[in-house]
Each structure stands twice: as structure tokens, then as C-alpha cells.
């Protein structure tokens, strides 16, 4: 039975040319996280973080993605094309797979504030 919940940074906005942290957190379960996959709205992989094998940053993002903090990702040098959905997929044992969603809006303006966190069950 899957008892856990994924908490994400939710809907966030950031400035063009700046950077943003994409963060998910799995709570309410004792399941072991074996891997976290980060994917973009068009199903392109940004990165994988395997518990034993560490990080794999995919080539399309290798110059703009920094691993962490934790199981999260830092996306740098933002462009307007980065606007869209991002998904964190937590592979766990014995629960199975949990998925969280973040919507990133990249703004031209100089004011870009993070919105409040929200939970995805």
C-alpha cells in the first residue's frame, strides 16, 4: 500500500537568465528511495539520481543543470522555452513509484517570486 505523499515547490516563477531550484520531497512513508528521475514537459530527461550510482545529467541540459540540493535540481541560465511542467518521479521500495509536478514560468520582468508550496497526494 502506497502511503507516501510528494511535496513539491509547486507553481514557481523565475527570471529569464536566472536560476531556479526544482525540489520534491517524499514524506509519510518508510519506503527506500532507490532513484529519482527528473523530466521536462516534453518527456525529455533532465537528470537521474540513483541512490547508489549517483547523478546522471542528460546532454541537452549538462551545461545548465546542477545536481542538488539533495534530490532536487538547479536549472540555470533560464530561457522562455523553459516555461512548462517538470516532473519528479520517485522510484521506491517497496511502495513503487510516486510522481510530483512543478510548473515553472520564466518571466521577462525583473520581479519573479516563488509561489507557496503545495502537496500532491
Amino acid at each position: 500500500m502506497m502511503t507516501g505523499t510528494i511535496e513539491t515547490t509547486g507553481n514557481i516563477s523565475a527570471k529569464k537568465g536566472g536560476s531556479v531550484i526544482l525540489q520534491c520531497h517524499l514524506s509519510s512513508t518508510m519506503a527506500q528511495v532507490t532513484q529519482v528521475n527528473w523530466e521536462q514537459h516534453d518527456h525529455s530527461l533532465l537528470a537521474i539520481r540513483n541512490a547508489e550510482l549517483g547523478w546522471h545529467i542528460y546532454p541537452a541540459f549538462k551545461d545548465r543543470v546542477a545536481p542538488g540540493p539533495g534530490l532536487g535540481l538547479t536549472l540555470q541560465s533560464l530561457t522562455m522555452n523553459d516555461t512548462g511542467e517538470y516532473f519528479c518521479t520517485y522510484h521506491t521500495y517497496p511502495d513503487g513509484t510516486y510522481r510530483g509536478r512543478i510548473f515553472l514560468e520564466v518571466l521577462e520582468s525583473s520581479v519573479a517570486e516563488h509561489s507557496a508550496r503545495f502537496q500532491i497526494p
Partner: antibody, heavy 118, light 107 residues
């Protein structure tokens, strides 16, 4: 970058064998070493991988009770011990290395042929 | 475990022909797919990764495409030295798994 594997082995059923893979041309602790099995005339199977910087390993469950992965950082050598050998373990075993922040098998050793026969 | 299916075990082609090899994953693997070439008596070699990037030194006649569950590896103009077995592999989730291989035969 070179991965030099040990020579062919002829072993008896039930015995164990320890294969070696000596790395050169790069900093050994910076990259994972992976092992791949290929039975004669067959396809490829991923066995597992080891992080030379801390000895942490991950396995294909199928090989968890078959293979033991270790490293000796002083000699830049990775080892794989195979235990309780049967004819199903007769194969070529390759050590491989990934890219930086990459899981792709970018470099391969020449392979070690293990033959299990009475 | 994710099963990677290469539907053709053998493909027979002629020098200069365009040939495509397909690989289907049993579940979503995003873009975490790699293609290897193994010539007779040799270790495999990395050709394509992620799944459309050519590895260093790989001729531009080799290309890859796909996302999700369906992937294609193409040789735009087959050369005699391309005689080999080609394998797809996923590393979306462990255990990483390979396709059964497609042997390219030159007529």
C-alpha cells in the same frame, strides 16, 4: 582510457572465480565501473556497478547472490567475484566505464571468458 | 524489469543502403536509451546516447531518435565495416536492460 581485464578462466562447477579490471588513463575514483555479461552467441546483461570512491555497489537483482564487486584504489583495479558457478555462468564478462555524470558505457575492456566445466 | 524488444534479429542490406533498426520498451523510458555496436570478436562500442547524441568519433551516418517507448537507430548509407550486431539499452531505471540485438548482414 584503458580497461585491461584478466585472462580466460576454466573453472569447475560449484567453484568461485575472481575477475580483475585494471583502469588507466584517468582518475579511477572519478567514475563508476560496471560489469556486463555476454553468453556465447547471446546478448548483453547488466550485472551491476561500483563506485570506486566509496565502494558502494548496485546490482541487477538476478546477480545479487552471484556477483561480488570490489575495488582496490591503490592499483586502480576493479574486481568481480562470481560464486557457486554453474554452466549458466559460462560467458564473456566485460568491465565498462561511464562518462562524467553519465550512465552510458563509454569504455569497455576486452572481456574475460569464463568457462565452467567439470 | 523493463523489456527492450528489437523486433528484427537480422537485417540484410547492401552497401550504400539506408537501414533502420527499431527498439521498443515495455514501459516509458523517456530519453534514457543508448545504442551499441558489436563487431565480430570485439567488445561493444558506444555509438548513440540519450537517444540522438553521437558519441565522440562516431561517423555522422549513424543517427538515433525516439522518446518514451519507441526508438530508432539509422545508418544513412551502410558501409561494409558496419557489419555488426546493434543493441539498444535503457538506463531509465535499474536493472538496466538491453535489447536482444539486431545483426546487420551485408549482401
Amino acid at each position: 582510457v584503458q580497461l585491461q581485464e584478466s585472462g580466460a578462466e576454466l573453472v569447475k562447477p560449484g567453484a568461485s572465480v575472481k575477475l580483475s579490471c585494471r583502469a588507466s588513463g584517468y582518475t579511477f575514483t572519478d567514475y563508476f565501473v560496471y560489469w556486463v555479461k555476454q553468453r556465447p552467441g547471446q546478448g548483453l546483461e547488466w550485472i551491476g556497478g561500483i563506485n570506486p570512491s566509496n565502494g558502494g555497489a548496485t546490482f541487477n537483482e538476478k546477480f545479487k547472490n552471484k556477483a561480488t564487486l570490489t575495488v582496490d584504489t591503490s592499483s586502480s583495479t576493479a574486481y568481480m567475484q562470481l560464486s557457486s558457478l554453474t554452466s549458466e555462468d559460462s560467458a564473456i564478462y566485460y568491465c565498462t566505464r561511464g562518462n562524467f555524470y553519465g550512465y552510458e558505457f563509454a569504455y569497455w575492456g576486452q572481456g574475460t571468458l569464463v568457462t565452467v566445466s567439470a | 524489469d523493463i523489456v527492450m524488444t528489437q523486433s528484427h534479429k537480422f537485417i540484410s542490406t547492401s552497401v550504400g543502403d539506408r537501414v533502420s533498426i527499431t527498439c521498443k520498451a515495455s514501459q516509458h523510458v523517456s530519453t534514457a536509451v543508448v545504442w551499441y555496436q558489436q563487431k565480430p570478436g570485439q567488445s561493444p562500442k558506444l555509438l548513440i546516447y540519450s537517444p540522438s547524441y553521437r558519441y565522440t568519433g562516431v561517423p555522422d551516418r549513424f543517427t538515433g531518435s525516439g522518446s518514451g517507448t519507441d526508438f530508432t537507430f539509422t545508418i544513412s548509407s551502410v558501409q561494409a565495416e558496419d557489419l555488426a550486431v546493434y543493441y539498444c539499452q535503457q538506463h531509465y531505471i535499474t536493472p538496466w536492460t538491453f535489447g536482444g540485438g539486431t545483426k546487420l548482414e551485408i549482401k
